[in-house]
Interface confidence: low
């Protein structure tokens, strides 16, 4: 037999064992020119001393072989004795170590068996009714194909699937979508209607994330508020990376899970923008306001479940003086200003009503006044902080008020609203004999004492009604009792108590008359 021809004799070996795990496989035969044909195959196992024979059976029942030696590719012409216009069955028998191994056969019409290309270029992936839809441009001059896919997960081997016949300029495939694991897909094509024709090579991997991106398992920590009124949010634990199939490890596009940080500033609701989304790698600085922070995981199919953390307000600011002056026209607040053209957000809320919405006012961008102060004023009619109760006031500042992460805390303090002078007056003042020349004066705590830092001191005044002499005794804001000494028996005294703030002198309580009885000796 000539080497260029298919030899119609018995091959020079005994038999073939098709039950072996090793041996020839993936035989593929197709036309490569008007009269030229090629068959190629893979050989699994040690290749030393292996001889390959391409076997061919014609529709007449006659069979022949090509001896290819150690080569796993053979080219032959339409003059080699193999019918190219009629159906033939081809397979490979590989002889080694006194045994013969056989490939699965292919049955085809060689002339019609054109080498089809796999899907090339961009394979678009989308979700359709809980399934995966892949779509791609049909390779040039190859309309009319049968398409298969294979897919695997990180823990499974390849599984084969069918996309069905395709007959258009674009081809598509519906594939299974896994809920919780990433998948690698590959596609291959062959000519439509030629059952035995060769499949194309497999396409490049298409990496597909799970339908549900993984729940982000992260942990945060937040630093204390610095002198600049800002604190840093830091990530203590990175989200775990998704396990990927073999062909999707490395820079495989399409399977990535991106994590984003969604920041929602709960304080100061009147500002322009309350929410900001930023990449998880870019951890922001925050003001001392209260925030909700969500970590959102998303993949090519959209966002997945998120986890939300609450970051409480940090009220431990540097001691900054807030002056509040109440005049006939209204009330004005003064505080040390920040830079030129700063917008301030003034927020207040009655103490004990933290669950309710705070009142909030945004100033126009303002420059410091000549004394270096910033101001905010409101009229009496507005009713702002008009009730006689304790308010928590926080002032935030930003040169870029629309940028959520550029706000800082200027101060956080308490203020007693309404007519604090009258409302703060101590009640239930009582006098008890203490000794022959002293008394104990007690009173109920001022309403101002419910407001942290507002009550500066109590002042107790004692007047000798005989001589009109007056003495005043300062008392710590935490005390509600004082002892008055060096009093004279039989003299009438009046005692009053007032509660002072840093900026306001309180109103005296109702005068309380008392005297120490003269002791009569026997």
């Amino acid at each position: 037999c000539r080497t260029s021809e298919c030899c119609f004799q018995d091959p020079p070996y005994s038999d073939a064992d098709s039950g072996s795990a090793s041996g020839p496989r993936d035989l593929s035969c197709y036309r490569i020119s008007s009269a030229g044909y090629e068959c190629s195959w893979q050989y699994e196992g040690p290749t030393a001393g292996v001889s390959h024979f391409l076997r061919c059976c014609l529709s007449s029942g006659r069979c022949c072989y090509f001896a290819t030696g150690s080569a796993t590719r053979l080219q032959f012409s339409d003059q080699a004795g193999v019918s190219v216009l009629h159906t033939v069955t081809l397979w490979v028998e590989s002889w080694a170590r006194n045994r013969t191994e056989k490939s699965p056969e292919v049955t085809l019409q060689l002339y019609k068996s054109v080498k089809y290309k796999p899907p090339l270029g961009d394979i678009k992936v989308s979700k359709l009714a809980g399934q995966l839809r892949m779509e791609w441009e049909t390779p040039d001059n190859q309309v009319g194909a049968e398409v298969q896919f294979r897919h695997r997960t990180p823990s499974s081997s390849w599984k084969l699937g069918d996309c069905g016949p395709q007959d258009d300029d674009t081809e598509s495939c519906l594939c299974p979508l896994e809920m919780n694991v990433a998948q690698e897909f590959q596609l291959r094509r062959r000519r439509l209607g030629s059952q035995g024709s060769s499949w194309s090579k497999w396409s490049s991997p298409v990496c597909v994330p799970p339908e549900n991106p993984p729940q982000p398992q992260v942990r945060f920590s937040v630093e204390q508020l610095g002198r600049d009124g800002r604190r840093r949010l830091t990530l203590k634990e990175q989200p775990t990376q998704l396990e990927l199939p073999e062909g999707c490890q490395g820079p495989a596009p399409g399977v990535e899970v991106t994590y984003q940080l969604q920041l929602h500033m709960l304080s100061c609701p009147c500002k322009a923008k309350a929410t900001r989304t930023l990449p998880l790698e870019k951890m922001p600085y925050l003001s001392g306001a209260a925030y909700n922070v969500a970590v959102i995981s998303s993949n090519r199919f959209g966002p997945g479940p998120n986890q939300t953390w609450h970051i409480p307000a940090d009220t431990h600011t540097e001691p900054v003086a807030l002056n509040i002056s109440v005049g006939t026209n209204g009330t004005t607040m003064y505080w040390p200003a920040r830079a030129q053209s700063t917008t301030y957000c003034i927020e207040w809320q009655p103490v004990g009503q933290e669950g309710s919405l705070a009142t909030c006012n945004l100033t126009a961008p303002q420059d410091p006044d000549p004394a270096g102060m910033a101001t905010y004023s409101w009229s009496r009619e507005s009713g702002a902080m008009g009730q006689e109760k304790c308010y928590h006031i926080t002032i935030f500042a930003s040169a870029h008020p629309k940028k959520l992460t550029l706000w800082s805390t200027v101060l956080s303090t308490y203020h007693f609203g309404g007519n604090a002078s009258a409302a703060g007056t101590p009640h239930h003042v009582s006098v008890k004999n203490h000794s022959l020349d002293s008394v104990s004066v007690d009173w109920a705590p001022s309403l101002l004492s419910t407001c942290p830092g507002v009550l500066k001191e109590y002042v107790v005044r004692c007047r000798d009604e005989d001589s009109n002499q007056v003495s005043e005794h300062p008392v710590q804001p935490t005390e509600t009792q004082v002892t008055l000494s060096d009093l004279r028996a039989g003299v009438a005294y009046t005692v009053q108590v007032r509660a002072d703030t840093a900026w306001l002198r309180g109103a005296w309580s109702q005068p309380q008359r008392f005297s120490i009885k003269v002791q009569v000796s026997d």
């Epitope: 018995d10 091959p11 070996y13 005994s14 038999d15 073939a16 064992d17 098709s18 039950g19 076997r55 059976c57 529709s59 007449s60 029942g61 069979c63 159906t87 033939v88 069955t89 397979w91 028998e93 013969t100 056989k102 699965p104 056969e105 049955t107 059952q195």
Partner: nanobody, 127 residues
Amino acid sequence: QVQLVESGGGLMQAGGSLRLSCALSRGIFSAYAMGWFRQVQGKEREFVSGISRSGSTTDYVDTAKGRFTISRDNARDTVYLQMNSLKPEDTAVYYCAAVTGTFPSSTYHNANAYHHWGQGTQVTVSS
């Protein structure tokens, strides 16, 4: 995809005869060596008989020699198993199988060697 369809099974008295047929479609029949196997529930499939592509060489399991005959008709794409002198121990599901390769060999007694299988036909022999 090659398809194999068996027929001819049934209920038969001991000593009787049956002829099983197996037709191949969607493939070139003459490219295949053909085999018959049988399986009793709960047991492995066992080789019964085989025939080469040309039909010139045949092979049988010892218990079938002299009683069973395998033949093929390449024009009709069909292989046959003529079973005479049936015994109750011949009761089983009979399967037809096809494989490309050089035949015969003890290799082909191994069910794993075969690529294509029919769905099976029941043969019951009563005493």
